[in-house]
Interface confidence: medium
């Protein structure tokens, strides 16, 4: 997260760290007791490493009573996701067992009504992604509030040049932005999961390259079918 600040510890109990061989790779969001939603491209970077999900964490390194690392029973990328595009960039991870819920571990309600968030709405994005262009990684969860950007502006040639489909949404990126390592994390508007940070190699913090988020409401049928 660029231009953000440290989050209040455990105030986002849905927040997950998707890890490979014990290292944070991507963000994720607990959407059901045994399921974490993340970004499909995250798996590409996992190679043949052991994928696990950390729940109940604030610090990645320090012991915390609520922290627990779960093995992944099944990884289900969206069937239409492709390595060369950010379309359908969603991944569902089934935990080896149901998560132990509590004040620091709780699923987040996700948007099912397929309607664009009003431009200008302030939404919260959180993650353990880099906090500087030099690539510095934080140990503790960071977050930032970002205004939603309308699709026409986001699709301008000087911005994302028509790449933003109806199934994506954008948020402003003027110095405050999600960045590398935040992919798969939640964009939360009004206490509801609206978007998932896409995992392209987008420049961060440049106002002409807004953050791109996959709209979960557009994938309600797929999410329901996998969780069923």
């Amino acid at each position: 997260i660029l231009g953000g600040r440290e989050a209040e510890a455990h105030a986002r109990p849905y927040m997950a760290s998707v890890q490979v061989n014990g290292e944070h790779l991507c963000g994720g969001v607990l959407v059901a007791e045994q399921w974490v939603l993340s970004a499909a491209h995250c798996l590409e970077d996992a190679a043949d490493g052991k994928v696990q999900v950390l729940l109940g964490a604030h610090s990645l390194s320090q012991p915390e009573p609520s922290k627990r690392l779960y093995d992944v029973l099944r990884a289900v990328p969206h069937p239409d996701s492709r390595p060369d595009t950010i379309d359908h960039d969603l991944l569902l991870l089934q935990l080896s067992e149901k998560a132990t819920l509590g004040p620091a571990v709780r699923p987040l309600p996700w948007q099912r009504v397929d309607r664009d968030v009003e431009p200008g709405t302030l939404c919260d994005v959180a993650g353990w992604g880099i906090v500087s262009h030099a690539g510095r990684r934080p140990d503790r969860l960071q977050h930032v509030l970002l205004p939603v950007l309308d699709r026409a502006t986001c699709n301008r040639r000087t911005h994302h040049d028509g790449a933003i489909t109806q199934r994506m949404m954008c948020a402003e990126s003027n110095r405050r932005d999600s960045c590398k390592g935040d992919s798969g994390g939640p964009l939360v508007c009004g206490g509801v999961l609206e978007g998932v940070v896409t995992s392209g190699s987008r420049v961060c913090g440049n106002r002409k390259k807004p953050g791109i988020y996959t709209r979960v409401a557009s994938y309600a049928a797929w999410i329901d079918s996998v969780l069923a």
Partner: antibody
Framework: EVLLQQSGPELVKPGASVKIPCKAS????????MDWVKQSHGKSLEWIGH????????IYNQKFKGKATLTVDKSSSTAYMELRSLTSEDTAVYYC???????WGHGTLVTVSA | QIVLTQSPAIMSVSPGEKVTLTCSAS???????LYWYQKKPGSSPKLWIY???NLASGVPARFSGSGSGTSYSLTISSMEAEDAASYFC?????????FGAGTKLELK
């Protein structure tokens, strides 16, 4: 298929105004700005400005401020450009374009003549 | 504003000949925002090359684009009759977006 339908040629008197429609179909109207361009005979294309259909926000080329006014009607997926205080210098073909000119209308010829 | 100068204004080319059209900018243009359009009489312009070197959908592979900074070009490896048209360069690197005056390509 993306289509931008513009109206037929207009013959207008000096000092009058003209409003040119551009009806969009084949895509979600609010997903892209609508741009307008002028092509005078034997001259280069000139960008007039664009409008964001979501909120009606406009950006104009300084040269056309006060000459052109861009509006949209979301309910009919139609963009409009009004040209006022017309002179012979305004005689040209006017194009609308979207997706930052991946798609163009067929153009509307405006002739200003007494 | 950035002025785009295209040369030559008119070019007569025999079928099979290699053609290079140039576009010179009065100040540096980001290669991501340099585009070319093809225009035939009575038709609206068509996006032909985007981001300096990417061919738009349906554009034959004999076309290519290159350049950086203030100097850009469009090349046809082997001229065909259907390529006779006007070609405009266009920049969106800074406001206002501007167009070159075009090069008219004629078949000899």
């Amino acid at each position: 298929e993306v289509l931008l339908q513009q109206s037929g040629p207009e013959l207008v008197k000096p000092g009058a105004s003209v409003k040119i429609p551009c009806k969009a179909s084949g895509y979600t109207f609010t997903d892209y700005d609508m741009d307008w361009v002028k092509q005078s005979h034997g001259k280069s294309l000139e960008w007039i400005g664009h409008i964001n259909p979501n909120n009606g926000g406009t950006i104009y080329n300084q040269k056309f401020k006060g000459k052109a006014t861009l509006t949209v009607d979301k309910s009919s997926s139609t963009a409009y450009m009004e040209l006022r205080s017309l002179t012979s210098e305004d005689t040209a073909v006017y194009y609308c374009g979207t997706g930052d000119f991946a798609y163009w209308g067929h153009g509307t010829l405006v002739t200003v003549s007494a | 504003q950035i002025v785009l100068t295209q040369s030559p204004a008119i070019m007569s080319v025999s079928p099979g000949e290699k053609v290079t059209l140039t576009c010179s900018a009065s100040s540096s243009v980001s290669s991501s925002y340099l585009y070319w359009y093809q225009k035939k009489p009575g038709s609206s312009p068509k996006l032909w090359i985007y981001s300096t070197s990417n061919l738009a959908s349906g554009v034959p592979a004999r076309f290519s684009g290159s350049g950086s900074g203030t100097s850009y070009s469009l090349t046809i490896s082997s001229m065909e009759a259907e390529d006779a048209a006007s070609y405009f360069c266009h920049q969106w690197s800074s406001y206002p977006p501007t167009f070159g005056a075009g090069t008219k390509l004629e078949l000899k």
